[in-house]
């Protein structure tokens, strides 16, 4: 056979020869020859390779450091890395989730639009007219002002984005 200049998918060119790549979960021990196939070995415990490859060393599984607020979301295999997520009340600081920060709380006058997850922070929104929030919270939405009319009461003090309306009895002296 003529020496190739390009190789098929899942092959690599070395010494004018097309050799098979090692499958995911295995590392390269020795290149193929005209007489032998590529020699591959499975990755060890706590190691992985997630692509067809010619790597001579497997990658170490990611360590989910509890000191950084991390825990294992999905255990790694010989073909996949470990996936870390954050402990309850915390979220990742980056897509790689290398460390965690405490979920942000929404200040009074703001309510939770979207509750935080292990990978995203709390999203707050200002309470619109007719709604309020009087606490700093990572869970509370803006609450609607109390409807005094439905209680047969009148507004004694107008509500704000931080306070509810204050209802009171109707003035019976008024004609």
């Amino acid at each position: 056979p003529e020496p190739p200049t390009a190789c098929r998918e899942k092959q690599y060119l070395i010494n004018s020869q097309c050799c098979s790549l090692c499958q995911p979960g295995q590392k390269l021990v020795s290149d193929c020859t005209e007489f032998t196939e590529t020699e591959c070995l499975p990755c060890g415990e706590s190691e992985f390779l997630d692509t067809w490859n010619r790597e001579t060393h497997c990658h170490q599984h990611k360590y989910c450091d509890p000191n950084l607020g991390l825990r294992v979301q999905q255990k790694g295999t010989s073909e996949t890395d470990t996936i870390c997520t954050c402990e309850e009340g915390w979220h990742c600081t980056s897509e790689a989730c290398e460390s965690c920060v405490l979920h942000r709380s929404c200040s009074p006058g703001f309510g939770v639009k979207q509750i935080a997850t292990g990978v995203s922070d709390t999203i707050c929104e200002p309470c619109p007219v007719g709604f309020f929030s009087n606490v700093s919270s990572a869970f509370e939405k803006c609450h609607p002002w109390t409807s005094c009319e439905t209680k047969d009461l009148v507004v004694q003090q107008a509500g704000t984005n931080k306070t509810d309306v204050v209802c009171g009895p109707q003035d019976r002296l008024r004609a």
Epitope: P3, E34, E37
Partner: antibody, heavy 117, light 107 residues
Framework: EVQLVESGGGLVKPGGSLRLSCAAS????????ISWVRQAPGKGLEWVSS????????YYPDNVKGRFTISRDNAKNSLYLQMNSLRAEDTAVYYC??????????WGQGTLVTVSS | EIVLTQSPATLSLSPGERATLSCRAS??????LHWYQQKPGQAPRLLIK???QSISGIPARFSGSGSGTDFTLTISSLEPEDFAVYFC?????????FGGGTKVEIK
């Protein structure tokens, strides 16, 4: 037609030397790796040596390493096996075989080497 | 070294019968295995490559299967010229090794 013809076999005393040749024809010799395989009388097949198409890489099992040397002359379409320090257990029919897609796809008819005092 | 164990050592069958020959590797070799046929006084001949790939000029009654450590050569219906010795060979790693052979003889 692919042809491989071995020669150089014969009777040799223990400790002696012998040089086997393999003449190739019918294909582009310089494009193929070639191996030597032997077969002791009434026994199975045993790989002895291999050489890459360019002659730059050679391979041996431990039991012949240091005693046998494989070489080739692509200009002459010829393969060689220099065997030194021969032992009684080297007695066998020696075949040369072409490596096509990592298989021994064509074989010679073999040459008999007898090591005896 | 990868050791190939062939079984049975001898298979006694009649023409027209089906022959099933086994080759077991001491460690996984994917599909890196070839089969050869050898008749008395002749050189071996390549029958099957890469465990199951057919060879041009070899009758269709010869087929191979298996991957990893267990391999099978099947002769669907024995012809008189099929009575011979069959060898498997691995090319997964050095040294290249052959099985001890299975002799298919006439019953």
């Amino acid at each position: 037609e692919v042809q491989l013809v071995e020669s150089g076999g014969g009777l040799v005393k223990p400790g002696g030397s012998l040089r086997l040749s393999c003449a190739a024809s019918g294909f582009t010799f310089s494009n193929y790796g070639i191996s030597w395989v032997r077969q002791a009388p009434g026994k199975g097949l045993e790989w002895v040596s291999s050489i890459s198409s360019g002659g730059d890489n050679t391979y041996y099992p431990d039991n012949v390493k240091g005693r046998f040397t494989i070489s080739r002359d692509n200009a002459k379409n010829s393969l060689y096996l220099q065997m030194n320090s021969l032992r009684a257990e080297d007695t066998a029919v020696y075949y040369c075989a072409r490596a096509g897609e990592k298989a021994m796809d064509y074989w010679g008819q073999g040459t008999l080497v007898t090591v005896s005092s | 070294e990868i050791v190939l164990t062939q079984s049975p050592a001898t298979l006694s069958l009649s023409p027209g019968e089906r022959a099933t020959l086994s080759c077991r590797a001491s460690q996984t070799i994917n599909n890196n295995l070839h089969w050869y046929q050898q008749k008395p006084g002749q050189a071996p001949r390549l029958l099957i490559k890469y465990a199951s790939q057919s060879i041009s000029g070899i009758p269709a009654r010869f087929s191979g299967s298996g991957s990893g450590t267990d391999f099978t050569l099947t002769i669907s219906s024995l012809e008189p010229e099929d009575f011979a010795v069959y060898f498997c060979q691995q090319f997964s790693s050095w040294p290249l090794t052959f099985g001890g052979g299975t002799k298919v003889e006439i019953k």
